[in-house]
């Protein structure tokens, strides 16, 4: 494009004779202040004529000449008021001021929209003497412009207290249109309507928007920015994008792509962490979560006994840490594991089911219908037991173990004795007579000891005193009689 | 409300011109698009093409390119639908329609017969 | 150009009796609008993008579809719902009509 200037800006010398951009020998300038590398610009709006009415600050100096005839009142001189001009360009503006020889060390300072512009500008100085004037010119130039630069540009120059401020030079950068709001990348549900917001800027004005789904222009007609697209509902990802036209040209959003809410994927890699008698804690990858995040999973563990009645137990948990301790299985038993994780729009399929076992753990009950009894001429007290029930041996029993507590005037003592698992029936020497003795038996796994069972107690008498009566603890539902030897 | 009234029926012999009008109201005429679209006697809709209100500029679908020419008069939110050089064959009844985002036509005008007949 | 088909040419109901009129595209198709047109009339809009009712329109009507398979559905037919019924595609241009089917009174 071209820089454009929409006010006409011709070069009018600003005094008799030769202007200074002419560069005659005679007129060269006497001093060039830069303020920044020097730069020659792609165009310049030099001053126009001098004596128009003026609106800037104008400063009327007190001092008279020789003659005592007052100073015509000081003033800059009037420039091109808007400059127009596209991204990109040079651009050359400039203020200038007459002020008498009597002043010294007058600077001139540029200013943008109400800020004094500092640092590396490029922004040049320079003077012209005359006999009795010196012609100030002050030049501002940008090599690139950018929006930034938008703006009001002033001159400012001190005298006597006094500050002279130039009429507004405007600035207006044009370029593509900018995009201000772009469409997002969004997850919607399947034929269900959402929006799309699109807004771009200039200068140039107006922008219009055309929408663009999947490569096909949605709107036949321009729209004015801002844009809100509704999207009547999607049933498989789409991209959109939208494109920003003005008296310069067309951008092009970046283009999004709108996902379709679906079930996830199930889950892969179901992983057994660890094991124990009655637990299994297993791990997951969770499969894509169908662009909905993952709200919980269920893990879903059916014995895998083929004479088992095919019961499925259903443990929920939250969808992380994608790891689960199934509490509440039996020991020593085979396990099909499978997991399923859901989102808002459902569940997903069930990951492969994979196969896991629980160890052998300690027997949850004790022995039952134990019976003690006092052997008094062998000196013995004779233990009989029932085993456990096979299901609640929670493995395979490796024995017994008894634990015996004497107890006589204020002395305690126990004992613990191993039993192999074939019998079911102990004998322990008698350690103290004119004692009690109390009896608990536990059965033995490789998975460990279970509970003991209720204490049994007898009497051991001092030597003389017999008596036959056993103690013990009856197996419940057992009519059987108790022998007494 | 919107609206879309067409000009009435016109008898026309072939080789003659014929100018069928589509006058809108009820909206801002320059911010859709207007559709043509021709319906010959028992036969179904055929979409002829459409004219960027914005812009002015038409769009011809392929056997409507030549002698048919869409235009507008946007001071009176007026669409036109010109054929020239009529057939026996252009004898049908056209619609005008306006056209919303995803080329959605949410009103459509009365209908205008043609006949061509010597 | 993309063409569109409809079936069938002519549908057959009692009043009462669920129509479903198929539309099917020679290449994927983005949305699906969906008139309705009765003898001497204009077309009236009746189905927009795919799934969605035009103003007015009872819920008895019903659009699906996606990719090159289109349909429209009346779950039970009232004797003013006779009459032709024509999809018309966006995606591309031209902008194209199927050639209609029309629901009569068995």
């Known amino acids: 494009a071209i820089t454009e200037a929409r006010e006409e800006a011709k070069p009018y010398p600003l005094f008799p004779g030769p202007f200074p951009g002419s560069l005659q020998t005679d007129h060269t300038p006497l001093l060039s202040l830069p303020h920044a590398s020097g730069y020659q610009p792609a165009l310049m709006f030099s001053p126009t004529q001098p004596g128009r009415p003026h609106t800037g600050n104008v400063a009327i100096p007190q001092v008279t000449s020789v003659e005592s005839k007052p100073l015509p009142p000081l003033a800059f001189k009037h420039t091109v008021g808007h400059i127009i001009l596209s991204e990109h360009k040079g651009v050359k503006f400039n203020c200038s001021i007459s002020v008498p020889n009597i002043y010294q060390d007058t600077t001139i300072s540029w200013w943008k929209d109400g800020k004094e512009l500092l640092g590396a500008h490029h922004a040049i100085t320079q003077f012209y003497p005359d006999d009795e004037v010196t012609a100030i010119i002050a030049s501002f130039s940008i090599t690139s412009v950018q929006r930034s630069d938008n703006g009001s540009y002033i001159c400012k120059m001190k005298i006597n207290n006094e500050e002279i401020v130039s009429d507004p030079i405007y600035i207006e950068v044009q370029g593509l249109p900018h995009f201000t709001k772009q469409p997002e990348s969004m997850n919607v549900t399947r034929n269900t309507a959402f929006n799309l917001t699109c807004q771009a800027v200039g200068p140039p004005e107006p922008v219009n928007i055309f929408w663009v789904q999947n490569s096909s222009r949605v709107n036949e007609q321009p729209e004015k920015s801002p844009s809100v697209l509704t999207v009547p509902g999607l049933t498989e990802m789409a991209v959109f994008s939208c494109e920003a036209h003005n008296d310069k040209g067309l951008t092009v959003s970046k283009g999004v792509q709108i996902n379709i809410k679906a079930i996830p994927s199930p889950p892969t890699e179901v992983s057994i962490r660890n094991s124990t008698a009655h637990s299994i804690l297993i791990s997951w990858v969770p499969g894509f979560d169908g662009y909905s995040p993952f709200r919980n999973c269920s893990i879903q563990v059916k014995e895998a006994d083929p004479l088992s009645n095919g019961s499925v137990m259903i443990f929920n948990t939250s969808a992380l840490p994608h790891l689960y301790q199934i509490k509440q299985l039996q020991a020593l038993a085979n396990y099909s594991i499978g997991v399923s994780c859901m989102n808002e729009i459902g569940w997903s399929a069930v990951s492969p089911w994979i196969l896991a076992s629980t160890t052998e753990g300690a027997p949850s009950v004790a022995p039952l219908n134990v019976t003690v009894f006092l052997n008094e001429s062998s000196d013995n007290v004779d233990i009989r037991w029932m085993k456990p029930p096979t299901k609640q041996q929670d493995g395979e029993l490796v024995g017994y173990r008894i634990s015996h507590v004497w107890q006589s005037a204020g002395i305690s003592k126990e004992l613990l004795e191993e039993v192999g698992q074939n019998g079911s029936r102990a004998r322990i020497s008698v350690q103290v007579h004119n004692a009690t003795c109390t009896v608990r038996i536990a059965a033995v796994t490789r998975g460990g000891v279970g509970p003991f069972s209720d204490p049994v107690k007898i009497f051991i008498p001092a030597h003389g005193w017999v008596d036959y009566a056993p103690s013990s603890t009856p197996a419940p539902g057992n009519a059987d009689p108790v022998l007494i030897i | 409300q919107v609206q879309l009234v067409q000009s009435g029926s016109e008898l026309k012999k072939p080789g003659a011109s014929v100018k069928v009008s589509c006058k809108a109201s009820?909206?801002?005429?320059?911010?859709?698009?207007v559709h043509w679209v021709r319906q010959a006697p028992g036969q179904g809709l055929e979409w002829m093409g459409w004219?960027?209100?914005?812009?002015?500029?038409?769009t011809y679908a392929q056997g409507f390119t030549g002698r048919f020419v869409f235009s507008l008069d946007t001071s009176v939110s007026t669409a036109y639908l010109q054929i020239s050089s009529l057939k026996a064959e252009d004898t049908a009844v056209y619609y005008c329609?306006?056209?919303?985002?995803?080329?959605?036509?949410?009103?459509w005008g009365q209908g205008t017969l043609v006949t061509v007949s010597s | 150009e993309i063409v569109l088909t409809q079936s069938p040419a002519t549908l057959s109901l009692s009043p009462g009796e669920r129509a479903t009129l198929s539309c099917r595209a020679s290449?994927?198709?983005?949305?699906m609008h969906w008139y309705q047109q009765k003898p001497g009339q204009a077309p009236r809009p009746l189905i927009y993008?795919?799934?969605n009712l035009a103003s007015g329109i009872p819920a008895r009507f019903s659009g699906s579809g996606s990719g090159t398979s289109y349909t429209l559905t009346i779950s039970s037919p009232e004797p003013e719902d006779f009459a032709v019924y024509y999809c018309?595609?966006?995606?591309?241009?031209?902008?194209?009509f199927g050639g209609g089917t029309k629901v009569e009174i068995k």
């Open positions: 329609a306006r056209g919303v985002r995803y080329a959605y036509m949410d009103y």
């Open positions: 009820g909206y801002t005429f320059t911010n859709y698009g």
């Open positions: 004219i960027n209100t914005y812009t002015g500029e038409p």
């Open positions: 290449s994927s198709v983005g949305y």
């Open positions: 993008a795919t799934s």
């Open positions: 018309q595609q966006w995606s591309s241009n031209p902008r194209t």
